[in-house]
């Protein structure tokens, strides 16, 4: 029977920067039941807290609540582990909640063929951002990431949309029923999980384009 | 304990391209984004561009895009920085870094010297 | 890019005595997300730098009080208030609010 293991603070995640939730992996627990907290400080300050809910993001995780969450304060944390034997503490970790910001998948993909008499046809999609998002204040861009295949193939092609919100591809097999789905990510944080599928078949008369793709 | 052991000391020829490794312990890699810093002998400090382990996102310094590749392999927890088309001016010491989740990094490798000399 | 102007190049100070370096940048510092991504490295001699003070005023883990940060906007100043023989190598001011992060040229400290 041993103190636990060094506990490692490894993720922290942001819906919409309002509220976050840091998650820890233990060591090894010696062989007896093991209590972990998490305390923390922000910048500026020296009175330390404890985790304000442990329940919220599952286990060995520690979520904050908009009441605790500022953007404007780094936030210095650390995990304790205890049992019978003694104790252990992670390394201190810092987190700046601008970049642990993972948004919600985008919202509303439609997607069309577009077949112009003027020109080639093409594939036309657009989305909107996740709503919980606000793109308003300036600070915050959001890439975007396109993925798209045949619904039986196995293989996606995926194509950065950089921070448009609209897409065209002009290359696209004729007759083929098409699964699209589209990402997003902060600048300096974590993609999105992919957009629930949106299908398009794809006219037996579209005509191939040699140019791949472009941005709207 | 934290550390960033970078590969050796490299000499390349001018118009070569030299990889530098960092390899990451002590952490879990997929976590922090890795920076890469060089310093020109006697000079100041040059940000090249950084790397998010998790999914290769990069951002570059446009000085180095185009002629800098950043790289990592997870399952050796290791970061590398290539250079191409190299010149005299690129002799330098070439730093990695690590960040918490934050814009800023603290922990940095020993640094590599890579001179360019024909 | 910003660019980052340390004063003065160098520096002799008598172990005990207080020691202050300036640090200007070509554009405000101010994050727009209200943050000021202004922090202070120190490269001792044969070494990797090594951060002392990130976001302005905050000490990071392990340095000693005698460090100090303070400025705002594009004024930031970093002050040793009693100097020691370890405080001696190169001062780096650096900002990771716009990209590319930039780097000062640098102030070399060494004792009397």
């Known amino acids: 029977q041993l103190p636990p293991g060094k506990p490692e603070i490894f993720k922290c995640r942001s819906p919409n920067k309002e509220t976050f939730t840091c998650w820890w992996r233990p060591g090894t627990d010696g062989g007896l039941p093991t209590n972990y907290s998490l305390t923390y400080h922000r910048e500026g300050e020296t009175l330390m807290h404890e985790c304000p809910d442990y329940i919220t993001g599952g286990p060995n995780s520690c979520h904050f609540g908009k009441q605790y969450t500022s953007m404007w304060r780094t936030y210095v944390m650390m995990v304790n582990a205890t049992n019978q034997m003694g104790s252990s503490f992670s390394d201190e970790l810092y987190v700046d909640v601008t970049y642990i910001v993972q948004p919600d998948p985008p919202l509303e993909l439609t997607v069309e063929v577009k077949q112009p008499e003027d020109r080639k046809p093409y594939l036309w999609m657009k989305w909107s951002p996740p709503t919980l998002i606000d793109l308003k204040t300036g600070w915050f861009t959001l890439l975007y990431e396109i993925r798209l295949k045949p619904e039986k193939a196995a293989e996606w092609e995926t194509h950065f949309a950089g921070q448009q919100t609209e897409f065209k591809i002009l290359s696209l097999h004729p007759g083929q029923k098409y699964l699209v789905q589209v990402r997003c990510k902060p600048d300096h944080g974590y993609w999105s999980a992919w957009s629930p599928a949106t299908f398009i078949q794809i006219p037996s008369d579209f005509i191939m384009n040699d140019h791949h793709h472009h941005h709207h | 304990e934290v550390q960033l052991v970078q590969s050796g000391a490299e000499v390349k020829k001018p118009g070569s391209s030299v990889k530098v490794s960092c390899k990451a312990s002590?952490?879990?890699?997929?976590?922090?984004?890795i920076h890469w810093v060089r310093q020109a002998p006697g000079q100041g400090l040059e940000w090249i561009g950084e790397?998010?382990?998790?999914?290769?996102?990069?951002n570059y310094n446009q000085k180095f895009k185009g002629r800098a590749t950043l790289t990592v392999d997870k399952s050796s927890s290791t970061a590398y920085m290539e250079l191409s088309s190299l010149r005299s001016e690129d002799t330098a010491v070439y730093y990695c870094?690590?960040?918490?989740?934050?814009?800023?990094?603290?922990?940095w490798g020993q640094g590599t010297l890579v001179t360019v000399s024909s | 890019d910003v660019v980052m102007t340390q004063t003065p190049l160098s520096l002799s100070v008598t172990p005990g005595q207080p020691a202050s370096i300036s640090c200007r940048s070509s554009?405000?510092?101010?994050?727009?997300?209200?943050?000021?991504?202004l922090h202070w490295y120190l490269q001792k001699p044969g070494q990797s730098p090594q951060l002392l003070i990130y976001?302005?005023?905050n000490r990071f883990s392990g340095v000693p009080d005698r460090f100090s940060g303070s400025g705002s906007g594009t004024d930031f100043t970093l002050k040793i208030s009693r100097v020691e023989a370890e405080d001696v190598g190169v001062y780096f001011c650096s900002q990771s609010t716009h990209v590319p992060f930039t780097f000062g040229g640098g102030t070399k400290v060494e004792i009397k």
């Open positions: 870094g690590r960040s918490f989740f934050t814009n800023w990094f603290a922990y």
């Open positions: 002590g952490y879990t890699f997929t976590s922090y984004w």
């Open positions: 790397i998010d382990p998790s999914d290769s996102y990069t």
């Open positions: 976001k302005v005023s």
């Open positions: 554009q405000s510092l101010v994050h727009s997300n209200g943050n000021t991504y």
